[in-house]
C-alpha cells in the first residue's frame, strides 16, 4: 500500500516530586517501520531512560506506537520527540504551560 504519514501527539501527565511523564504517540501510519525517540537539548536520550510501546496494528490497516520518558517539571522546553517515517521526519515539542496536548499530522 501507499505511505500514510503518522499523526504525532505529545502529552504530559503529572507524577510525584516535581517530575512529569511525557509521552509521544504516533498513530495511523503505514508502513510499520518508524523511529520515535525523545531528545534532550537536541541529543537522543539514552535508551535506558525511555520506554517504548510495541508497534501495533490499529485496526485500519495502519499502525500505532509510543515512547515515554520522565522529565523535571519546568524543563519541558528542552525536550522534543523526534519521528522518522518513510523518509519524512519531524520534531515535536512538549506542550508548555497548561496546554497538555499537541497534535500534528505529517505530510
Amino acid at each position: 500500500g501507499s505511505t500514510v504519514p503518522p499523526m504525532v501527539n505529545v502529552t504530559c501527565s503529572e507524577v510525584s516530586e516535581g517530575n512529569i511523564t511525557v509521552t509521544c504517540r504516533a498513530s495511523s501510519f503505514y508502513p510499520r517501520n518508524i523511529t520515535l525517540t525523545w531528545r534532550q537539548d537536541g541529543v537522543s536520550l539514552s535508551h535506558n531512560t525511555q520506554q517504548w510501546g510495541d508497534v501495533l496494528p490499529d485496526g485500519n490497516g495502519t499502525y500505532q506506537t509510543w515512547v515515554a520518558t520522565r522529565i523535571r517539571q519546568g524543563e519541558e522546553q528542552r525536550f522534543t520527540c523526534y519521528m522518522e517515517h518513510s523518509g519524512n521526519h519531524g520534531t515535536h515539542p512538549v506542550p508548555s504551560g497548561n496546554s497538555h496536548h499537541h497534535h500534528h499530522h505529517h505530510h
Epitope: 534532550q40 537539548d41 537536541g42 541529543v43 537522543s44 536520550l45 539514552s46 531512560t49 523535571r72 528542552r78 522534543t80 523526534y82 522518522e84 521526519h89 520534531t91 515539542p93
Partner: antibody
C-alpha cells in the same frame, strides 16, 4: 564572561591513565550539556564524549568507549574526563565545549583553550 | 556510527572565486542536526552554519549552506582573504556524534 579552562594534560606512558578537568565560570554550569572534543596534531576535530546537564545522557565516541569516562560535579562547576588504557593515538589537544540551546537550535558555543595530552614511552 | 567525509580535503581559491565544499554522510542526517564550524589556526572552532542552511550570527552573506539526507554543501559565493580556514561539518542526528574530516580552504 563564559570561561572554560581545561587542565590535567601532560605526558603519559601507553597503557597509563589520566584525568582531565574543565573548570567552568561565568554561566550556570548545571544547566548546560558539555562535550569533550579533541584534535590530534595537524589533524581534524574528533568528538570524544558528551554529558547532559543532569548527567542523564552520556555518549562516547567508538574510539574511546570502555576506556574513557565523562562525569561532572555541578556544585563545583567542573567537568571531568577519566582516561585509562591510553594509546599513542589518544595524543591530542583536548577541549571542553559548551552545548548551547537557543530557539530550538543546539550547538557548541564556547570552547576552552585546551589541554595537551601526549601518550608516549 | 555516521561517518562524515568532506571533499576536497584541501582547496586553493583565488579572491573573488566561488568555492563549494561537500559533506557526505554514510547514512541519512536530518538537516536540523547538521552544522558547519569554521576553525582558524590557533583558535577554537566557531559555529558557521546551523541546521544545514542558516548562517550563524556575524557570518557574511556570501556564505550559504544546503543539502539533505546524505549530502550537504557549504558555498562561499565570492572568496575573501578572511575566509581562509578549515571548515568542519558536524552531525548529532545519531549518537555517537561525529565531525567531518574537514576541508581546508587556502588563498591561491
Amino acid at each position: 564572561d563564559v570561561q572554560l579552562v581545561e587542565s590535567g594534560g601532560g605526558l603519559v606512558q601507553p597503557g597509563g591513565s589520566r584525568k582531565l578537568s574543565c573548570a567552568a565560570s561565568g554561566f550556570t554550569f548545571s544547566t548546560f550539556g558539555i562535550h569533550w572534543v579533541r584534535q590530534a596534531p595537524e589533524k581534524g576535530l574528533e568528538w570524544v564524549a558528551y554529558i547532559s546537564y543532569d548527567s542523564r545522557t552520556i555518549y562516547y565516541a567508538d574510539t574511546v568507549k570502555g576506556r574513557f569516562t565523562i562525569s561532572r560535579d555541578n556544585p563545583k562547576n567542573t567537568l571531568f574526563l577519566q582516561m585509562t588504557s591510553l594509546r599513542s593515538e589518544d595524543t591530542a589537544m583536548y577541549y571542553c565545549a559548551r552545548w548551547a540551546y537557543e530557539g530550538g537550535v543546539n550547538y557548541f558555543d564556547n570552547w576552552g583553550q585546551g589541554t595537551t595530552l601526549t601518550v608516549s614511552s | 556510527q555516521i561517518v562524515l567525509t568532506q571533499s576536497p580535503a584541501i582547496m586553493s581559491a583565488s579572491l573573488g572565486e566561488r568555492v563549494t565544499m561537500t559533506c557526505t554522510a554514510t547514512s541519512g542526517v536530518s538537516s536540523s542536526y547538521l552544522h558547519w564550524y569554521q576553525q582558524k589556526p590557533g583558535s577554537s572552532p566557531k559555529l558557521w552554519i546551523y541546521s544545514s542552511s542558516n548562517l550563524a550570527s556575524g557570518v557574511p552573506a556570501r556564505f550559504s549552506g544546503s543539502g539533505s539526507g546524505t549530502s550537504y554543501s557549504l558555498t562561499i559565493g565570492s572568496m575573501e582573504a578572511e575566509d581562509a580556514a578549515t571548515y568542519y561539518c558536524h552531525q548529532f542526528h545519531r549518537s555517537p556524534l561525529t565531525f567531518g574530516t574537514g576541508t581546508k580552504v587556502e588563498i591561491k
